[in-house]
């Protein structure tokens, strides 16, 4: 399992992981106490046939070619959590591990 | 976590799981001894903002709107394995659980 890493200067057109810092303050999400910003990353790019396919299933669907199947798209294939401190709906302070907040790898699925 | 289930008669345009039987015999993939066919399913449909989003990350990337981010696409969000009997490259018969062969749920990611 591997994936490409790119940045804003890359000329790569294929599915790639790009850096992205999410800034909760800039969104006005004041219920998030910490972190105020974090490195989230995102996926973008083209999925040519077989390139970076995460699952054999993706290849099989391509072979079978059913009506309306739109070929694979560039999407997170490995994600990780971050720890956050935030207010819940009852205005209690919660500290917890929030899953799937950081993209570690991108692939075609 | 939930996802829509559709069939070939559905008029649903949103991201949905559709039935698909993969037939290895029809592909001529005779190195797969068994099963000769199995129910794989696939994902198809539109991902309107927030509909069936699997990760908070998807929402955050939409908010941040970086260059080249293409919005979420309809992709498997839950998959399961099947047991297979097949010949490897050395013509040894292998029996094993092959991960991510069946789509159990589709979502926007």
């Amino acid at each position: 399992d591997f994936g490409l890493d790119c940045d804003e200067h890359s000329t790569e057109s294929r599915c790639c992981r790009y850096p992205l810092t999410v800034d909760f303050e800039a969104f006005g999400w004041d219920w998030i106490i910490a972190p105020k910003r974090y490195k989230a990353n995102y996926c973008s790019g083209e999925c040519e046939f077989v390139f970076l396919q995460k699952y054999p299933h993706t290849h099989l669907v391509h072979q079978a070619n059913p009506r309306g199947s739109a070929g694979p798209c560039c999407t997170p294939t490995k994600m990780s959590p971050i720890n956050m401190l935030y207010f819940n709906g009852k205005e209690q302070i919660i500290y917890g591990k929030i899953p799937a907040m950081v993209v570690d790898r991108c692939g075609c699925s | 976590d939930f996802g829509l289930d559709c069939d070939e008669h559905s008029t649903e345009s949103r991201c949905c799981r559709y039935p698909l039987t993969v037939d290895f015999e029809a592909f001529g993939w005779d190195w797969i001894i068994a099963p000769k066919r199995y129910k794989a399913n696939y994902c198809s449909g539109e991902c309107e903002f927030v509909f069936l989003q699997k990760y908070p990350h998807t929402h955050l990337v939409h908010q941040a709107n970086p260059r080249g981010s293409a919005g979420p696409c309809c992709t498997p969000t839950k998959m399961s394995p099947i047991n297979m009997l097949y010949f490897n490259g050395k013509e040894q018969i292998i029996y094993g659980k092959i991960p991510a062969m069946v789509v159990d749920r589709c979502g926007c990611s």
Epitope: - | F24, E25, D30, W31, I32, I33, A34, P35, K36, N83, L85, F87, E91, I93, Y95
Partner: antibody, heavy 124, light 107 residues
Framework: QVQLVQSGAEVKKPGASVKVSCKAS????????MHWVRQAPGQGLEWIGN????????NYNQRFKARATLTVDKSTSTAYMELRSLRSDDTAVYYC?????????????????WGQGTLVTVSS | DIQMTQSPSSLSASVGDRVTITCKAS??????LSWFQQKPGKAPKTLIY???RLVDGVPSKFSGSGSGTDYTLTISSLQPEDFATYYC?????????FGQGTKLEIK
């Protein structure tokens, strides 16, 4: 429907060879194991071996390994069993049979279709 | 090789009888046992596989049971067409081995 049609009866002299054919129809020949079993007159069944036509991977009963050869012709969907150095106790009906996979485990098989059998008589 | 010992070697019974044939393996065969029926001049026909599963189209009067080394084929109510020779087969390991057969005759 799935069918296995075997070649006709043979009479051979001791020391000779015989090649029995089994023509498959009604299914994808290359993707199913073909087995060979024999039955001497008034006796029980004896497993000779099997072959996977896609890549000709085969297994033999040690009793026959030195004298038997299993082959296939994919272009005609035909399996063959050749037995060399024939002796009088090789006189038997020889059957081909398709092995069908029914389950999820590595040994989940059964014989679902048999050929009609080929009588091989070894006599001087 | 795994030895399969079938008993009895022959059996006389009447129409309507319930009969039992047994097969004993020389070691545990993990329920990888099939039962066959063979009529004179014909190829064998699979009745039961995996010790107790009935092949599609085989009447439910045939049933199989057992585990480990001991297995049984039962025919609940004999009909004239059931008089034949019955064989067991182990497929747990190569070489596959058959029992010597049980000839079921009309009394």
């Amino acid at each position: 429907q799935v069918q296995l049609v075997q070649s006709g009866a043979e009479v051979k002299k001791p020391g000779a060879s015989v090649k029995v054919s089994c023509k498959a129809s009604g299914y994808s020949f290359t993707g199913y194991f073909m087995h060979w079993v024999r039955q001497a007159p008034g006796q029980g069944l004896e497993w000779i071996g099997n072959i996977y036509p896609y890549n000709s991977v085969s297994n033999y009963n040690q009793r026959f390994k030195a004298r038997a050869t299993l082959t296939v012709d994919k272009s005609t969907s035909t399996a063959y069993m050749e037995l060399r150095s024939l002796r009088s106790d090789d006189t038997a009906v020889y059957y081909c049979a398709r092995r069908y996979y029914y389950g999820t485990g590595p040994a989940d098989w059964y014989y679902d279709v048999w050929g009609q059998g080929t009588l091989v008589t070894v006599s001087s | 090789d795994i030895q399969m010992t079938q008993s009895p070697s022959s059996l006389s019974a009447s129409v309507g009888d319930r009969v039992t044939i047994t097969c004993k393996a020389s070691q545990d065969i993990n329920s990888y046992l099939s039962w066959f029926q063979q009529k004179p001049g014909k190829a064998p026909k699979t009745l039961i596989y995996r010790a107790n599963r009935l092949v599609d189209g085989v009447p439910s009067k045939f049933s199989g049971s057992g585990s480990g080394t001991d297995y049984t084929l039962t025919i609940s109510s004999l009909q004239p067409e059931d008089f034949a020779t019955y064989y067991c087969l182990q497929s747990d390991e190569f070489p596959l081995t058959f029992g010597q057969g049980t000839k079921l005759e009309i009394k």
